[in-house]
Each structure stands twice: as C-alpha cells, then as structure tokens.
C-alpha cells in the first residue's frame, strides 16, 4: 500500500485558508506546480526543502506551493482566509493520539507515563544515547517530544530528565480509543483515517484508486473532510474507501461512546402517524407492508437472513416487527413473513407533508419503478389498465405494459417532467406525482440549449385570421382580473385555455377571478364592442418549479377580429440569439399619469451564459428559462405584467416563447429579463389541452 503512495491523504485540508508568519525568522519555500498532490509528495519526502515540512498551502490561482516548517498550531503563525488558498497540514504533527505502535507520531507530548519530563533528543544529559536527530532523519526527534523511531512495542517513549529513570513510555492513547461514535456513526465527524485492518483511507475528494459518488460538494452535510471515516449511507458503522486498489472499502474501528446519546441536530424528526421526508424518524407501529403481508421481526433471521439487526443498527428503534427505515431507503420497510417476498415498503403510511416526495427519479423518470401511487395534490392514482385507451390517445407507440403495474406513478409517454398517473377524477384526469429528481442527477431533459437545433416555428407561412395578419393583432392578450381589478397578463393559446403565471392566483376561490379578452385599455374603456368577459373554471398548475398555470375558461372564447390565439413553439426548440421579441402588459409603467393602455417593450434574445454574466454571475439559468435584454434602457416587464408573454417571431410566425414571472426584478438597466421558457413546457401544455375536457361553445 505504500508503493508509489499518494501522500496527500496524510494531510488535513482547510479550504480557503492560508498561514501568515508573524515571526520573520520562520522560513518558507515556494515553487510553481500543477496540483496539490505534487505539493504533498514533496512535503512528505522533504525533497529539496531546507527544513522538515509540516504543512503547505496550495495557491490555486497562481498554481503555486508554499511549504512550511510550521503549522497552524505553531507560535509566530496565524491563519487567514483567502479564496484561492487551501491549507494542508501533515496529520502526524497535529494528531494527539497514535495509530498502532505510534511510529508516525509527531505530536508535542513531552511527559512520560509517570509524569517525568522528557530529556531533549539532542542532549546527552542526564542520559547518553545514540538516538541523534541526525541519525534518525524523518523520525522528527525534535525538542524533547515522545517518539518511537524504531516502532517498538510500547509506543512512543523518551529518555527522561530524571537520572534514576533512563527511559519510559509516554501515555499517548490509541486513536481508536479516543475516537467514539453514537448509534451507527451517521453523525460521526471525528478524525479516524484508517480502516480496522490498518489500511489508509482514500480522500473523499479523490477518485483514485476507487471511483465513487460521495463527492464532498454534492453532499455538503455528510462531513466528507479529507479521508476520514464516515457513514453517509446508513451502514452499521463508519467506513471509507481505501488506498489499496484491491480493497474498495472497509469499516473503521471506532468504538461506541460511553454516553451513547445523539445530538439534537442528528435526530431525524420522530413521527408516529405519518412519514416525514424518507421516514428515517418514523417510530409508529405499522407492521405490514403495503399489501397487508405481515413484517418479520427485526431480531429474527426467519424466513429471511439479514444483518439489519437491532445490535447493528442502534438508535434506529428496530423493535418488534414495525416498519422502519434504518438504512436511508426511499421510505419505511421491513422483511416480510412470506418466504417468497424478502422485503416490502410500507407505503400505506401517509406522508406528513405530501410535498416531500419519499422517492426520487433519474432523467425524466421513464425508468422509475417505485411504488408511490398518489399525485402531488394527494389524489390516489387509478389503475393503469383502466386508462390504456386514454394513454393510446396521446402516445404514438405501444407503452411497456410490464412497467405499468397496479396504480404506481410511471412515465410511459416520456414526459419531460417526471412520473405521473391517471386519477379517476374527471376534473383532473392525470397529474404528476410528488417525486423529485434524485440529488445530483444532472441528466438534461433537453440538450444543446444554446445551439439552434430545432426551429421554434411550426410552419413557414404567414397565418391570417379574418383577413388581418396576426402580426399586427394582439388579440391573444388576456387581462386576468382579481376581485374586479387587473392583476396579471396572460396569453390565449386555445379557445378555452390561457397560459399565465402561478403567482397570479392568490386566492383558491375561482369566483374571485375573471378573464377579459379583446381589450386595449385595462379598464375596458372604449372596448365595449370587442371585450369578452369570461369566468375561470379551473387552474392546472405546471410541473413542479415551472411557475406556470393553464387557466381553463368557463366557456370558450369566440375568435374574431379582436380575440385570437397565439401559437406555441416546438418542444425543446431554441430561438437564435439577437432575435427581436416583445413583451406586453398593462402593468406599472413608471409614469404617474398612467393611461391604462396596453404597452409593448422590445427585447432581443440573449444566450443563457451571456445573460448570467449580465446578472454579474448571481443567477445561473437552466434549461427551463429564457433570457431577453431590452433594446431601450429600463424597458421591460414589471408588476402587473406577470403572466404575460414574451412574443417572438420566426419565419413570419409569432409565438409565445416566454412567460413573465416574479423574482427577476422590474426592468433594470443592463439587466436582461429572465422568463419561463415555454418551449421547455410545450409538451406539458399540449398534453393538458389534449387530455382535459373543456366545455363546448
């Protein structure tokens, strides 16, 4: 394991930290290098350094090493914050315990077991000896510190300052005795960095010799510091990947603390009637799986042998045969008493909060095979076999029937927004399930965002309605009224459907809303001939996080010279940068004598990366957002415009490419607006229009 070792594992890392020497006599050495690993190797071997290297700083910006003969505990030194620096301190010099015989111990204990002060190694008084620092290079025979240069049985020792006692061992504890954990060590944040067989642990931020998913930046709450033993995944006790290429991982020997209590911060919220999160804190007495099969006792090995015993999983309350989640599974589960069914989830236990999905999916969830069977609004899913006719109506291939079992949430139509199910409720034929994408899953659902692959326009003809070119007509613009006042804009995309923003509906009482169509003046003055006033019959909320709503009108709008629909873009399309677009709204204009007339502001499309730069890097845009900058300083959407459209033209066809939503501020000079990207949600819109029933005119 020592052959061509990667010595960075022997260092404790403190990110964004450097050491400043207050004492000018302290030496340092610097050199340009590529990686922190190179600094570590040189520090460990003391190669070409005029001192014993105890720590180094890697300057990431300048790609430079600064080697030190001191560390953060030395006098004449202070720690300082610095974005570009990472401090690495040799653990041997800061450890206050020993591993094995303590051959590598380089701490500062200088008193023997019986309390006698140690004699300095460079002195021959009171005892003459041959253990000279010059003869034992690398063994750090400094000052009068306890050492074990030959790796002898008793551990670190020293010659004593008492002429009567030549030498004596020092009372330095084993690291395995100092380190202790509670329960199964999920909250352990100690400094044990080797396994129970003595193998050195691999750093969590390294992928060699073993590739793994536990990246510190992906799991900031798991304590993945340096190469210390941890228990991120509900194992019986802490473990680590090892530096031995033939041993992927091994448990660490960390004893249970005498006072086996958990910190409040480590305890999952205990519930007895329902599941919070993934149900790790569920302590109720449900003892059957979802279909009624009784659970096997946790302390029994019949009919299924297992290691999920109360002894292995202390603090997980593995009492009797109650459903529990000791290992961070999707939800509480148990071994079953049926010899043919090893385990089953207790999915009949309700969620304390439906919004916390107890499950996750990858990509768009088309391979999701979990057993959640409830929509995000709490409706029970209906059986797939009862809905096959409806499913065939909106997909053009044969769905995989083997996946469509029972009434579980699935994604048979390749929906971009995750698993869903039919509900059996005629008003809400189907809805998404409260399942999120798995943490760290970055599979894009649309690729090549900034490269125009798919055209947004469906056709290349100029569409004309009643002899009036739609490009001069804004009949698709809707004024959403709340308690008789204009509150938001919206776009008529079909006779019965208006696309708008989720935030435009403060009340749940649909009687509080109306849609005005065919108007130019926000108060409807002079628009009496052309105005259509329609009630709202339903709100269909967009996929989680979309901020979109499809508002169903109580009766279809009548399309005429003043009221028209606007086209949707193709799903996943990209509109070229610098395309000229417009936003429309009756919102706040910044004028004191606001005349209430529909306003337009001209914007141009900007790529997501460029847009992020304009926002000084404070916003990262994703595939569900589109950005447009103002041609005129300070023109753009504001309060009262929310829900309204960003309209662009391609091949002489006008489309709604964006929806104005709160959260990105009113039009600030040099700050482009960020809109919900309709193309990303186009399939969802079509699916709703196709599957939700609307009143006939």
């Amino acid at each position: 394991q020592r052959k061509r070792r990667n010595t960075i594992h022997e260092f404790k890392k403190s990110a964004k930290t450097t050491l400043i020497k207050i004492d000018p006599a302290l030496k340092i050495k610097t050199k340009k290098v590529n990686t922190a690993d190179q600094c570590a190797n040189r520090c460990t071997r003391n190669k070409g350094l005029p001192f014993t290297c105890k720590a180094f700083v890697f300057d990431k910006a300048r790609k430079q090493c600064l080697w030190f003969p001191f560390n953060s505990m030395s006098s004449g030194v202070k720690k300082e914050f610095g974005h570009e620096f990472d401090l690495y301190e040799n653990k041997d010099y800061i450890r206050n315990c020993i591993i094995g015989k303590g051959r590598s111990y380089k701490g500062t204990v200088s008193i023997t077991k019986s309390g006698i002060k140690c004699q300095p190694w460079s002195s021959m008084i009171p005892h003459e000896h041959s253990f000279l620092p010059s003869s034992y290079r690398g063994k750090d025979l400094q000052e009068n510190y306890c050492r074990n240069p030959r790796g002898e049985e008793g551990g670190p020792w020293c010659f004593t300052s008492n002429p009567e006692v030549r030498y004596e061992v020092c009372d330095i504890p084993q690291c395995s005795e100092v380190e202790c954990m509670t329960c199964n060590g999920e909250s352990y944040r100690g400094l044990m960095d080797h396994t129970e067989s003595g193998k050195i642990c691999q750093r969590w931020d390294h992928q060699t010799p073993h590739r793994h998913k536990f990246l510190p930046e992906r799991y900031p709450d798991k304590g993945f510091d340096d190469n210390y033993c941890r228990n991120p995944d509900g194992q019986p006790r802490p473990w680590c990947y090892t530096l031995d290429p033939h041993t992927r991982w091994e448990y660490c020997a960390i004893k249970t603390c005498a006072d086996n209590t958990m910190n409040d911060t480590d305890v999952p919220l205990e519930t007895t009637e329902c599941i919070q999160g993934q149900g790790e804190g569920y302590r109720g007495t449900v003892n059957t799986i979802w279909n009624g099969i009784p659970c096997q006792r946790w302390d029994s090995q019949y009919p299924h042998e297992h290691d999920m015993t109360p002894e292995n999983f202390k603090c997980k309350d593995l009492r009797e045969n109650y459903c529990r989640n000791p290992d961070g599974s999707e939800s509480p589960w148990c071994f079953t008493t049926d010899p043919n069914i090893r385990v089953g989830y207790c999915s009949q236990i309700p969620n304390c909060d439906m919004s916390h999905g107890q499950d996750c999916y990858r990509g768009n969830g088309k391979n999701y095979m979990g057993n959640l069977s409830q929509t995000r609004s709490g409706l029970t899913c209906s059986m797939w076999d009862k809905n096959m006719e409806d499913l065939h109506r909106h997909i053009f291939w044969e769905p995989d029937a083997s996946k469509l079992n029972e009434n579980y949430c699935r994604n048979p139509d390749d929906d971009a927004h995750g698993p869903w199910c039919y509900t059996g409720n005629p008003l809400i034929p189907w809805d998404y399930c409260p399942i999120s994408r798995c943490e760290g899953d970055t599979t894009p659902t649309i690729v090549n965002l900034d490269h125009p692959v798919i055209s947004c326009a469906k056709t290349k003809q100029l569409r004309v309605v009643n002899g009036i070119p739609t490009r001069t007509n804004i009949g698709w613009m809707v004024s959403l009224r709340y308690r008789n006042k204009h509150i938001c804009g919206g776009s008529l995309i079909k006779e019965s459907w208006v696309l708008t923003a989720r935030q435009c509906f403060p009340s749940r009482d649909l009687k509080d809303y109306e849609a005005w169509l065919g108007i130019h003046d926000v108060h409807g003055r002079g628009d009496e001939k052309c105005k259509q006033v329609l009630n709202v019959s339903q709100l269909v909320y967009g996929p989680e996080g979309s901020d979109l709503v499809l508002m169903k009108l109580a009766r279809p709008a009548v399309l005429d010279d003043f009221v028209s629909t606007i086209d949707l873009p193709n799903y996943g399309c990209t509109i070229p940068e610098k395309t000229s677009c417009s936003v429309y709204g009756w919102g706040y204009t910044g004028l004191i004598n606001y005349d209430g007339l529909l306003r337009v502001a001209h914007l141009y499309i900007m790529g997501n990366e460029k847009c992020s730069q304009h926002h000084r890097g404070k916003v990262t845009l994703n595939e569900s957002e589109i950005c447009a900058g103002a041609e005129k300083i300070g023109s753009g959407p504001c309060e009262g415009d929310y829900g309204g459209p960003l309209v662009c033209e391609q091949h002489k066809m006008r489309m709604v490419l964006g929806v104005i939503v709160p959260g990105r501020g009113c039009a600030i000079p040099n700050r482009p607006g960020i809109f919900v990207r309709v193309a990303y949600y186009a399939k969802w819109i079509h699916k709703i229009i196709l599957t939700y029933k609307v009143p006939q005119s």
Partner: antibody, heavy 115, light 110 residues
Framework: SVEESGGRLVMPGTPLTLTCTVS????????ISWVRQAPEKGLEWIGV?????VTDYASWAQGRFTISKTSTTVDLKIPSPTTEDTATYFC?????????????WGPGTLVTVSS | AYDMTQTPASVEVAVGGTVTIKCQAS??????LAWYQQKPGQPPKLLIY???KLASGVPSRFSGSGSGTQFTLTISGVECADAATYYC????????????FGGGTEVVVK
C-alpha cells in the same frame, strides 16, 4: 427571519409606518401578511401583500391601512391611528406566493396610540 | 366571506388528558385551514396546516382533522408546556373577510 420595527407611542391622527424586514428568503417567493393583537385580545388579520405586488385587506382595515413593499421590506402605513389601533403588530411570512398559512412570524412591535 | 368561529373560548384539562378544539368556517374552505399556538409574550407558532399536516418540529400529540366547514384540533397526552391559546386560520380566500383567524381557545393545564 422576519422582524418588525417602527412601533412607538403616537398621538391619535399622527401617521405611523411599521416596517417588516425579511432575510433568508425573497419577497419574490413569499407573500407577507400583517396581523395585530390588542392587549389581552385575539389575533386580528389586517392585510397581505402578494408576490406580484397586489394587496388584500380585511374588510374593516380597507382604507385604514396601506401595505407596500421593496425588495427586502414590507411597510404597513397607518395614516390616521386611533386609540383602537393600540396593539402588538406582527408581520408573518405566508407559505408560498398567494394566500396560505403563515410559517414564520416576527417577534412583534408595540404601537400605543394615546393622547 | 370566509369567517371563522372557534369553540370553546376556554378549556381546562389535566396533564395526560385530551383536549379538542373546534373551528367552523362560514362556507366551505376545503382543507385550507391552519392551527397556531401562542404563549404570552410570544408570536404565534404554526402547528398544523392543510387541516391535518403537522408542521416541522411539532410533537405528534397534536393532530388536526376535518374539511369543508368543520375542523378539529386534538391534543392528546397533554403536557404542561401545552398551556397556551390556540387559533385557527382559513387559508382559502380573503374576499370580504373580517378576520382570517378564529377567536382563539385558551387551554389551561391543571
């Protein structure tokens, strides 16, 4: 967190503005409500300002109070306080952007209207 | 209007006992109801939302039920720390509302 300020002793008819300062969340994600409690009395809802800037008031509070906001503060203006307006005034974060339950409350600020 | 009526105004209960507080809406509010606990000198604290969902960190001895116009808050295995005033609040609509809160129920623990 949310925290109220501006509560003090005022004469009847002297305009008063209370401010709710928010941190750790954005007013573009959550609505904010004002609630008051007269000494030894129950909670009385005054009004709410939604994410989109629209306001709603209790029927008795309409015209007596005005709620407005900036990016990090929400103001409650009492243009002409009366002795009946003596109370502790709370601002509360509404769960979500519209009307809903209140999942975060400030400690309150005391307004005393007296001549 | 969606106004709320809470009963009783006050209730006395022994440690370990169970207390039930009722809240009635003037018209249906589906499940859009929340319950709060308030102790003297403190702001209210959310206990239950959407009629039956337990807020984060709230002990499971608190439970809520009901929908439409009739709602109940139950505290079982009452502890001394539960002595407080409890309020319901409708989270449905504020059109022409006088008060979104119920009048409150004082719980005295013996």
């Amino acid at each position: 967190s949310v925290e109220e300020s501006g509560g003090r002793l005022v004469m009847p008819g002297t305009p008063l503005t209370l401010t709710c300062t928010v941190s750790g969340f954005s007013l573009s994600s959550n609505a904010i409500s004002w609630v008051r409690q007269a000494p030894e009395k129950g909670l009385e809802w005054i009004g709410v300002i939604y994410v989109i800037g629209v306001t709603d008031y209790a029927s008795w509070a309409q015209g007596r109070f005005t709620i407005s906001k900036t990016s990090t503060t929400v103001d409650l203006k009492i243009p002409s306080p009366t002795t009946e307006d003596t109370a502790t005034y709370f601002c509360a974060r509404v769960y979500d952007s519209g009307w809903n339950h209140f999942n975060l409350w400030g400690p309150g600020t005391l307004v005393t209207v007296s001549s | 209007a969606y106004d709320m009526t809470q009963t009783p105004a006050s209730v006395e209960v022994a440690v370990g006992g169970t207390v039930t507080i009722k809240c009635q809406a003037s018209q249906s509010i589906s499940s859009w109801l929340a319950w709060y606990q308030q102790k003297p000198g403190q702001p209210p604290k959310l206990l239950i939302y959407e009629a039956s969902k337990l807020a984060s960190g709230v002990p499971s001895r608190f439970s809520g039920s009901g929908s439409g116009t009739q709602f109940t808050l139950t505290i079982s295995g009452v502890e001394c720390a539960d002595a407080a005033t409890y309020y319901c609040q409708q989270a449905y609509s504020v059109a022409n509302v006088d008060n979104a809160f119920g009048g409150g129920t004082e719980v005295v623990v013996k």
